[in-house]
Interface confidence: low
């Protein structure tokens, strides 16, 4: 007869490991007992359990409650055992020794490999600001056994660099994602993807990018100067800009204080019925924590009577 086992048994941390040991004997042969021991190089054998054909399973004190027989039905020639709740310290060499009648004793070794799934963490880099050069957006670290794979999933253009640190029983992998910040990246997801044979599916951690910027300011409302005439109601100027964080707006008049009756409502400057007093240079000041911008416009309130008089003159001149 001969012993059948596996060269390597692979199990995920916390799962149960089946250590196979099957005696394929000739007809009439019987298995008397199967002894399991841990036999790491440089250390003496440590008994796990003894499986006796008559008296059943005996587990050594060091493995009490952790070694069991596989569930029935059981073949009397099967000396396999279950090692419950595998931990990293269980990784190593194991030997099964089978005593048979009448053929004698056989032994076989296997290696137990315990996969330690990673628990990845994502750390955002320093605050991103438009105008910076290549900047760290985020770093992602995962430690496991064997070494995990750390990659990035994103629509954002950038570069990655990885480094790994080997520990006694595991390896830590850190991947960094660098980019040149631009406002188009705002709100875009940057996802760290960690792969490992101990994971049923990839682990993903998503970081939403925030890039500080402030767009140039401009003022709307003066597109048709002819509308800015004495007596007009509802005239307003609107300051246009955008930024991250959202900017605040402030209105001033360059050539003096804001006329009475002029209302400031955030980005909008509202005028009462227009008079020539409202003519002047108005400045919209836009700012956020990142930067500030100014835009100024000249308001020239027209007197319709003057205008029509000029038109008559022009007509008569023709």
């Amino acid at each position: 007869g001969e012993l059948e086992t596996s060269d390597v048994v692979t199990v995920v941390l916390g799962q149960d490991a089946k250590l196979p040991c099957f005696y394929r004997g000739d007809s009439g042969e019987q298995v008397g007992q199967v002894a399991w021991a841990r036999v790491d190089a440089g250390e003496g054998a440590q008994e796990l359990a003894l499986l006796h054909s008559k008296y059943g399973l005996h587990v050594s004190p060091a493995y009490e409650g952790r070694v069991e027989q596989p569930p029935p039905p059981r073949n009397p020639l099967d000396g396999s055992v279950l090692l419950r709740n595998a931990v990293q310290a269980d990784e190593g060499e194991y030997e099964c020794r089978v005593s048979t009648f009448p053929a004698g004793s056989f032994q076989a070794r296997l290696r137990l490999r315990v996969l330690v799934p990673p628990l990845p963490s994502l750390n955002p880099g320093p605050a991103l600001e438009e105008g910076q050069g290549l900047t760290l957006a985020a770093s992602c670290t995962a430690e496991g056994s064997p070494a995990p794979s750390v990659t990035w999933d994103t629509e954002v253009k950038g570069t990655t660099s990885s480094r790994s640190f080997k520990h006694s029983r595991s390896a830590a992998v850190t991947s960094e994602f660098h980019l040149v910040p631009s406002r188009s990246m705002n709100g875009q997801p940057l996802t760290c993807v960690v792969s490992h044979p101990g994971l049923l599916q990839d682990q993903r951690i998503t970081h939403i990018l925030h890039v500080s910027f402030l767009a140039e300011a401009s003022v709307r409302g003066l597109e048709d100067q002819n509308l800015w005439h004495i007596g007009r109601e509802g005239a307003m100027l609107k300051c246009l800009s955008e930024g991250q964080p959202p900017p605040s707006y402030n209105w001033t008049r360059l050539d003096g204080p804001l006329p009475s009756g002029v209302r400031v409502d955030g980005d909008t400057l509202g005028f009462p019925p227009l008079t020539t007093e409202h003519s002047g240079i108005y400045v919209c000041h836009v700012s956020n924590e990142f930067s500030s911008r100014d835009s100024q416009v000249t308001v020239d309130v027209l007197d319709p009577q003057e205008d029509s008089g000029k038109q008559v003159d022009l007509v008569s001149a023709s």
Epitope: S6, D7, V9, P20, L110, P146, S149, S195
Partner: antibody, heavy 122, light 106 residues
Framework: TVTLDESGGGLQTPGGGLSLVCKGS????????MAWVRQAPGKGLEFVAG????????GYGAAVKGRATISRDNGQSTVRLQLNDLRAEDTGTYYC???????????????WGHGTEVIVSS | ALTQPSSVSTNLGETVEITCSGS????YGWYQQKSPGSAPVTVI????KRPSDIPSRFSGSASGSTATLTITGVRAEDEAVYLC????????????FGAGTTLTVL
């Protein structure tokens, strides 16, 4: 002696699906990892899919990921490959392979089937 | 990916080595294919294990990220393509193969 018998190949239509089955004998089927490896005409070997001894872990080559499913029935000593959305580049000889341990790496294949030919053409 | 020379030639009776390098974290296997479309034959698995029906002139070893297949006393019937296989533990966790080395026996 270890034998691995593949079946299910033949002419397939693009966009369709195929199911290959491999039956193992001469070894304790439930103790070993199994894999499917293919070879396109004039090309080298390419790992398609693998499954561990217990059937609880699987791995797929990049070319078939999302289209392939590997499964095993230890009671029947069979391993099955289901490949959907067939393409012309799936044409080749598909080999069933047994590993010496419970995983499915191409580092420890110790037995191969004779192969079954798959042609994807309209 | 696994890298191996595209071709190696040797004289009858000599010793030849074929190398394979790459990121196989768990070991290497060597597979012989005598003609395209014919089933591969395992000559070495798990770095240095030889199936019982493979002649003892075939041996394997691995050091670091390089594996070596050694054929001592090459015979004419050893002329074939030899492919190395491994297990990719760095990214996708699947089996991987080299492109193959054509051994020519002069």
């Amino acid at each position: 002696t270890v034998t691995l018998d593949e079946s299910g190949g033949g002419l397939q239509t693009p966009g369709g699906g195929l199911s290959l089955v491999c039956k193992g004998s001469g070894f304790t089927f439930s103790s070993n990892g199994m894999a499917w490896v293919r070879q396109a005409p004039g090309k080298g070997l390419e790992f398609v899919a693998g499954v561990n001894a217990a059937g609880s872990w699987t791995g797929y080559g990049a070319a078939v990921k999302g289209r392939a499913t590997i499964s095993r029935d230890n009671g029947q000593s069979t391993v099955r490959l289901q490949l959907n959305d067939l393409r012309a580049e799936d044409t080749g000889t598909y080999y069933c392979a047994k590993t010496a341990d419970d995983w499915y790496g191409a580092d420890d294949i110790d037995a191969w089937g004779h192969g079954t030919e798959v042609i994807v053409s309209s | 990916a696994l890298t191996q020379p595209s071709s190696v030639s040797t004289n009858l009776g000599e010793t030849v080595e074929i190398t394979c390098s790459g990121s196989s974290g768990y070991g290497y296997g060597w597979y012989q294919q005598k003609s395209p479309g014919s089933a591969p034959v395992t000559v070495i698995y798990s770095n240095d294990k030889r199936p019982s029906d493979i002649p003892s002139r075939f041996s394997g070893s691995a050091s670091g990220s390089t594996a070596t297949l050694t054929i001592t006393g090459v015979r004419a019937e050893d002329e074939a393509v030899y492919l190395c296989g491994g297990y990719d533990s760095s990214a996708s966790y699947v089996g991987i193969f080299g492109a193959g080395t054509t051994l020519t026996v002069l």
